[in-house]
Interface confidence: low
């Protein structure tokens, strides 16, 4: 099933319009904003989700603004151009013809330029470091239990193959989840680590993208894990190209 047949909805993406107009009257869902057909048996690409989000006027939030020592999403929301497969186009431009190159998770990886800016290829983000700080608890979580719960979450909720969760580190109150997925490792049908990280980020913020599901209720041995801040660092297979002025 690409979508739930009984009431024709998309379990993995609430930002869709679904109707029984697919082959043989099957339920087919299209992403808001782009109108592209999506596979509701897996996660929708981040590019299509951002495009859908921009089409909904009520969503005007900015993303976290961590330090600039790493490649982080400092630019907030934008209306991206997606390719026919739903991936980010390597070059993104705004309404005023300011352009920049992005990586596979849509984060800017060059200085901004004009329409003459070239972005030769979409550079893959192969390592994502999710840095979480949890709210105070009676004591530290047991690391093995925390590790198991987060791996279970990524496997079951986001359908990410366990081999792509490289490590879960914990030093109270900081949790670091490392997702790693090289181009050569990602097989057809594998969820992209960028998409899994984006769904997780939205879940943590209480903005679940799943249809009809309750929000994320993360518990470690029954103890609620409440996140008070999230930083996500993106590491690309090819280093980003910023001029020195951005690094000062």
């Amino acid at each position: 099933h690409t979508a739930a047949q009984d009431n024709c909805t998309c379990p993995t993406n609430k930002m869709t319009v679904c109707s029984p107009d697919g082959p043989g009257g099957r339920c087919q869902c299209r992403a808001l904003g782009s109108g592209m057909a999506v596979d509701c048996s897996t996660l929708t690409s981040k590019c299509l989700l951002l495009k859908a989000r921009m089409s909904a006027p009520k969503n005007a939030r900015t993303l976290v603004r961590p330090s600039e020592h790493a490649l982080v999403d400092n630019d907030g929301l934008y209306d991206p151009d997606c390719d026919p497969e739903g991936r980010f186009k390597a070059r993104q431009c705004n309404q005023t013809s300011v352009c920049w190159c992005v990586n596979s998770v849509g984060v800017r990886r060059t200085d901004k330029g004009d329409l003459s800016l070239r972005c030769d290829e979409l550079v893959r983000t192969h390592h994502i470091l999710i840095d979480l700080r949890h709210r105070p608890t009676a004591g530290a979580f047991n690391h093995s239990d925390l590790d198991a719960e987060l791996r279970r979450l990524f496997r079951e909720r986001y359908r990410l193959h366990p081999k792509f969760v490289a490590a879960v580190h914990y030093e109270q109150p900081t949790i670091q989840i490392e997702l790693r997925q090289n181009t050569s490792q990602k097989a057809a049908g594998d969820v992209d680590i960028g998409d899994a990280a984006y769904y997780f980020e939205r879940d943590i913020k209480g903005e679940s993208l799943f249809q009809g599901r309750g929000g994320l209720d993360l518990r470690v041995r029954g103890e609620p894990l409440q996140v008070e801040r999230t930083l996500i660092y993106y590491l690309d297979e090819i280093p980003p190209k910023f001029s020195m002025k951005r690094l000062t």
Epitope: H126, H127, L129, D131, H143, S144, Y170, E178
Partner: antibody, heavy 117, light 107 residues
Framework: EVQLVQSGAEVKKPGASVKVSCKAS????????INWVRQAPGQGLEWMGN????????NYNQKFKDRVTMTRDTSTSTVYMELSSLRSEDTAVYYC??????????WGQGTLVTVSS | EIVLTQSPATLSLSPGERATLSCRAS??????IHWYQQKPGQAPRLLIY???ESISGIPARFSGSGSGTDFTLTISSLEPEDFAVYYC?????????FGGGTKVEIK
């Protein structure tokens, strides 16, 4: 080819500090942790801590927390490990090693630090 | 911190024999264990990562198994160059820790 090249041997007096460097090449420097591991003569391996060059995030072994500082210089792809208040039991070979979330795949050649009065 | 206990401390075997090295963790660490070989005067060399994953360039006679708390490194048939010290290391939580090592010596 991935390479980690460390600075040369050092002889220090008790109470002094030593700063060992580790220059990386052949891979994206900011993408992988650099760990520091030491080995006293005839002893096993002991993890001292690590640094994530992308954002200078560090983790130190509690045993060394008050004495060790790890820094990085992205312009030269070099990581530094400074150990202060040296004592005789700090005499060891100090190794840097890159960590790609899948074991310490690459190692420096080691730097012998001798602490003697 | 997680304590890794390796046994035996010394293993005396002849070339061609099978070597079985054990590493026990003080708590469940899933498969976050890595194995290294070290020869005198050299830096350690990664042999196996995540308990059983093989490394490019490492001979197939080296294999790893186990999960949770008990792990094994097996050398199916010892070659003369395999006589060395072997260490396990965990990356399940900081601080990372190493086992005390197992010396494989010629009988």
């Amino acid at each position: 080819e991935v390479q980690l090249v460390q600075s040369g041997a050092e002889v220090k007096k008790p109470g002094a500090s030593v700063k060992v460097s580790c220059k990386a090449s052949g891979y994206t420097f900011t993408s992988y942790w650099i760990n520091w591991v030491r080995q006293a003569p005839g002893q096993g391996l002991e993890w001292m801590g690590n640094i994530y060059p992308s954002n200078s995030y560090t983790n130190y072994n509690q045993k060394f927390k008050d004495r060790v500082t790890m820094t990085r210089d992205t312009s030269t792809s070099t990581v530094y490990m400074e150990l202060s208040s040296l004592r005789s039991e700090d005499t060891a070979v100090y190794y840097c090693s890159s960590y790609r979330s899948d074991g310490f795949a690459y190692w420096g050649q080691g730097t012998l630090v001798t602490v003697s009065s | 911190e997680i304590v890794l206990t390796q046994s035996p401390a010394t293993l005396s075997l002849s070339p061609g024999e099978r070597a079985t090295l054990s590493c026990r963790a003080s708590q469940n660490i899933g498969t976050s264990i890595h194995w290294y070989q070290q020869k005198p005067g050299q830096a350690p060399r990664l042999l196996i990562y995540f308990a059983s994953e093989s490394i490019s360039g490492i001979p197939a006679r080296f294999s790893g198994s186990g999960s949770g708390t008990d792990f094994t490194l097996t050398i199916s048939s010892l070659e003369p160059e395999d006589f060395a010290v072997y260490y396990c290391q965990q990356s399940n939580s900081w601080p990372f820790t190493f086992g005390g090592g197992t010396k494989v010596e010629i009988k």
